[in-house]
Amino acid sequence: MAVTACQGLGFVVSLIGIAGIIAATCMDQWSTQDLYNNPVTAVFNYQGLWRSCVRESSGFTECRGYFTLLGLPAMLQAVRALMIVGIVLGAIGLLVSIFALKCIRIGSMEDSAKANMTLTSGIMFIVSGLCAIAGVSVFANMLVTNFWMSTANMYTGMGGMVQTVQTRYTFGAALFVGWVAGGLTLIGGVMMCIACRGLAPEETNYKAVSYHASGHSVAYKPGGFKASTGFGSNTKNKKIYDGGARTEDEVQSYPSKHDYV
């Protein structure tokens, strides 16, 4: 039960995260005009990955796409690439994880296959989240650098007679959406990887030997291991109580060398 919940929650958290990454990528407010300590203008500028916008105090908003590809800064291109890679990996991860969900039965798919798919989607979510966080962080770093550069020469002009105010940009809402979404996708991926450990069926290479002790009937299984999923051999003896009901989810409750957190 715990594994199903972990897997389901991981899926939902990742889904929200990827939706957030897509939203952040499409948003126009990656950088917004800094209003603090700046001359007050009746025009508000903000920029996204794909276009820049201007909102007048009249309410009229005009957005212009970046129609050039070669003329754009390399950093912006890199951020775009990171976000797109994050979305693509996340989308594939979602697709894989849907089939890996324990609550969904597809033909005679074995638990070991579901475990593999869960692990695959988990890794994809982790990489997707990292791509988004990296992309947003690169953009934020670019903004900070430009901010201080434009602050240093905020007013330029000929002999101080005519002043040109340079527009300074600060963090836009999309950056925060991106960071949160990337974090959620990462957490979802970790949860999927954790769930994967409890999904694969327990297998043994020899039959358990029964020892009849007074009182309870207890079977000891020395040195059982998971061959199918490539997990390391279990050095702990695991007691199996004949009398107690046990769910599938409780099978892999001991730690292995493939702990992802």
């Epitope: 005009q33 001359p39 007050v40 203008t41 009746a42 025009v43 500028n45 920029q47 820049s52 916008c53 201007v54 007048e56 105090s57 009249s58 309410g59 009229f60 005009e62 212009r64 005519v162 002043q163 040109t164 105010v165 340079q166 527009t167």
Partner: antibody, heavy 118, light 113 residues
């Protein structure tokens, strides 16, 4: 079409206050900043300030900050400007005008002539 | 505050003549975000409220005759009337519509001979 109704004249005594009104129609009143402009007889135009009817946010010309108070009544689509401690310097025509493309003022009221006289 | 300087203060021309008037601002009115100049031109006839002629320095308001054209960028702007008509007798104001407080030029009075 956009219409801005302003009373024609206001005669007030020095030191007194006056509240000028500007009733707007023909557009969504709460969506656009309302600007106020002063023009003394035979002189140029002076921007007093503006107010956003939806939230009451405003911008003022520092020169008029203690002189003019801008308010709105959304229910009647009316903008108000209260002028306090009036002197002969405040005798002028006061116009209201909502913001337009390019932050310009395309529609103007006919103006209220305020005369400060003992 | 942004200072708007208009010149000349008055002009006397004959009908049909071409007229140019200048407006200079103490700060650039060019917005880098959309490459638009936030300068507005108004015409005020005696006893009337001002009338919008041009916004964004060169965009003609609907209903304004095409003899009125605006040009310039940054801090230097020009209003040109290609062929002055009798009804163009008025005071022409330029306005900074970029920085608060919005400021107007002192005006150019156009008189017809």
């Amino acid at each position: 079409q956009v219409q801005l109704q302003q009373p024609g004249t206001e005669l007030v005594k020095p030191g007194a206050s006056v509240k000028l009104s500007c009733k707007a129609s023909g557009y969504t009143f709460t969506s656009y900043w309302m600007h106020w402009v002063k023009q003394r007889p035979g002189q140029g135009l002076e921007w007093i300030g503006n107010i956003h009817p939806s939230n009451g946010g405003s911008n003022h010309n520092e020169k008029f900050k203690s002189k003019a108070t801008l308010t709105v009544d959304k229910s009647s689509s009316t903008a108000y400007m209260q002028l306090s401690s009036l002197t002969s310097e405040d005798s002028a025509v006061y116009y209201c005008a909502p913001i337009y493309y390019g932050n310009s003022l395309a529609y103007w009221g006919h103006g209220t002539l305020v005369t400060v006289s003992a | 505050d942004v200072v708007m300087t208009q010149s000349p203060s008055s002009l006397t021309v004959t009908a049909g003549e071409k007229v140019t008037m200048s407006c200079k601002s103490s700060q650039s009115l060019l917005n880098s975000g959309n490459q638009k100049n936030y300068l507005t031109w108004y015409q005020q006839k005696p006893g009337q409220p001002p009338k919008l002629l041009l916004y964004w320095a060169s965009t003609r308001e609907s209903g304004v005759p095409d003899r009125f054209t605006g040009s310039g960028s940054g801090t230097d702007f020009t209003l040109t009337i290609s062929s002055v008509q009798a009804e163009d007798l008025a005071v022409y104001y330029c306005q900074n519509s970029y920085f608060y407080p919005f400021t107007f030029g002192s005006g150019t009075k156009l008189e017809i001979k």
